[in-house]
């Protein structure tokens, strides 16, 4: 039901301290709708890198994509791989590092084009959430303004939050990602209390706005862990 979908609203985990990579959202949707496969988050550093299994790009960090580690390898065995830099070969946008996109099989800079009319090579479905400016930690390169006729309004498809107008973020919405409002003070948010605690969020909320954090509502402290209500509150 819609209510159960709405109640599962969540935002992917917050970015780690500066220098760490964005965490992985939890899991992938199976071919049978409604079945969630549990997974976990990982914070990746150069010193401590472990291959992270995945099924979709959305499960990987902002500078990664999901693919088989060997060329022509078993599609059933996929891990998060480092994104491809400019002039490297690609099959889709998600393979290219932020600030680039996949054109004719090559990662090219987004700001090398004026993007007149519709540009075909775009991914609206890599459901990962990008906290591009959250808490001042920029994880993605802001794309050139030349790329857009206008910023996406609420309800329009997006790839990352920089595609959306001010006050909106790019969040998962079923099979796609669309621009949704950044949460305001008092609005309900979801805080994942431990790694791996969340399944795939098919209907995802944005993060709390500037100066706000997702914290347990004061009058809900006595509630059980599973029913605790989190809201966006002033720091």
């Amino acid at each position: 039901t819609l209510n159960s979908v709405l109640n599962s609203n969540a935002i992917k985990n917050l970015p780690p301290p500066l220098g760490g990579a964005a965490g992985h959202p939890g899991s992938a949707v199976s071919a049978a709708p409604g079945i969630l496969y549990p997974g976990g988050n990982k914070y990746q550093t150069i010193d401590n890198y472990q291959p992270y299994p995945c099924a979709e790009d959305e499960e990987c960090g902002t500078d990664e994509y999901c693919a088989s580690p060997t060329r022509g390898g078993d599609a059933g065995v996929q891990i998060c791989l480092a994104c491809r830099k400019r002039r490297k070969r690609c099959m889709r946008h998600a393979m290219c590092c932020p600030g680039n996109y996949c054109k004719n099989g090559i990662c090219v800079s987004s700001d090398q084009n004026n993007f007149r009319g519709e540009i075909e090579e775009t991914i609206t479905e890599s459901f990962g959430n990008d906290h591009s400016t959250l808490d001042g930690y920029s994880r993605r390169t802001t794309l050139s303004s030349k790329m857009y006729h206008s910023k996406g309004q609420e309800g329009s498809v997006c790839l990352r939050s920089s595609d959306c107008a001010t006050g909106l973020c790019c969040a998962r919405h079923f099979w796609s990602k669309i621009c949704k409002p950044v949460l305001k003070e008092g609005q309900v948010c979801t805080k994942h209390r431990r790694k791996g605690s969340h399944g795939l969020e098919i209907f995802q909320r944005c993060y709390c706005g500037e100066g706000l954090s997702c914290r347990i509502q004061k009058d809900h402290h006595q509630a059980s862990n599973s029913s605790r209500l989190h809201t966006c509150q002033r720091h």
Epitope: E56, R92, R116, E125, S156, V157, L159, H173
Partner: antibody, heavy 124, light 107 residues
Framework: QVQLVESGGGLVQPGGSLRLSCAAS????????LHWVRQAPGKGLEWVSS????????YYADSVKGRFTISRDNSKNTLYLQMNSLRAEDTAVYYC?????????????????WGQGTLVTVSS | DIQMTQSPSSLSASVGDRVTITCRAS??????LNWYQQKPGKAPKLLIG???SLQSGVPSRFSGSGSGTDFTLTISSLQPEDFATYYC?????????FGQGTKVEIK
């Protein structure tokens, strides 16, 4: 030019199977989520199924769940709908549709581009 | 499921008329609503995205408004090529659901 061309429709008996295909061209197929929407003769539009760009996430209408399977082959730029245990009420024109892009002018929306459809008739 | 109720189900109008079609959702859907035009034997064509965003190539006589549960598609001055059936689609909740359609006929 975005083009979506459905095929595979035809006459089939109740309980039978059909596999619809949607051949895509004019855009990088693997970058988009795709959908099947149907329209019974003289009736309105009904969403059937959706699949994410990578193919791992699939969604179905209750009316077809367990009978229909959506899939895609990104290497062939083709979307499929395997339809089993067909019923008379599945008779319809089946359209494949594609979402818009954040690089459209203005930024795009879901179910933005549609094929011309293929007719499936389930009758004894 | 979210039900979408379109009204009227059909209307007769003349060229130059101002035409208004409404779509009501059974619960709030914010602005997650598209409007489509469909002509006989043809595929639907997206006119308006997210309640009010006119799509590229669509004449400016078409406009959309509304948020929450009530939405309106307006054709400011009906042209001969506008006689068709119009559908709304909500994509706020799963499953996506269409209105039953409004057929705009020549008076």
């Amino acid at each position: 030019q975005v083009q979506l061309v459905e095929s595979g429709g035809g006459l089939v008996q109740p309980g039978g199977s059909l596999r619809l295909s949607c051949a895509a061209s004019g855009f990088t197929f693997s970058n988009y989520g795709l959908h099947w929407v149907r329209q019974a003769p003289g009736k309105g539009l009904e969403w059937v199924s959706s699949i994410s760009y990578y193919g791992s996430s699939t969604y179905y209408a209750d009316s077809v769940k367990g009978r229909f399977t959506i899939s895609r082959d990104n290497s062939k730029n083709t979307l499929y709908l395997q339809m089993n245990s067909l019923r008379a009420e599945d008779t319809a024109v089946y359209y494949c549709a594609r979402d818009g892009s954040h690089m459209d002018k203005p930024p795009g929306y879901v179910f933005a581009f549609w094929g011309q459809g293929t007719l499936v008739t389930v009758s004894s | 499921d979210i039900q979408m109720t379109q009204s009227p189900s059909s209307l007769s109008a003349s060229v130059g008329d101002r035409v208004t079609i409404t779509c009501r959702a059974s619960q709030g859907i914010k602005n997650y609503l598209n409007w489509y035009q469909q002509k006989p034997g043809k595929a639907p064509k997206l006119l308006i995205g997210a309640a009010s965003s006119l799509q590229s190539g669509v004449p400016s006589r078409f406009s959309g408004s509304g948020s929450g549960t009530d939405f309106t598609l307006t054709i400011s001055s009906l042209q001969p090529e506008d006689f068709a059936t119009y559908y709304c689609l909500q994509y706020y909740g799963m499953p996506p659901t269409f209105g039953q359609g409004t057929k705009v006929e020549i008076k």
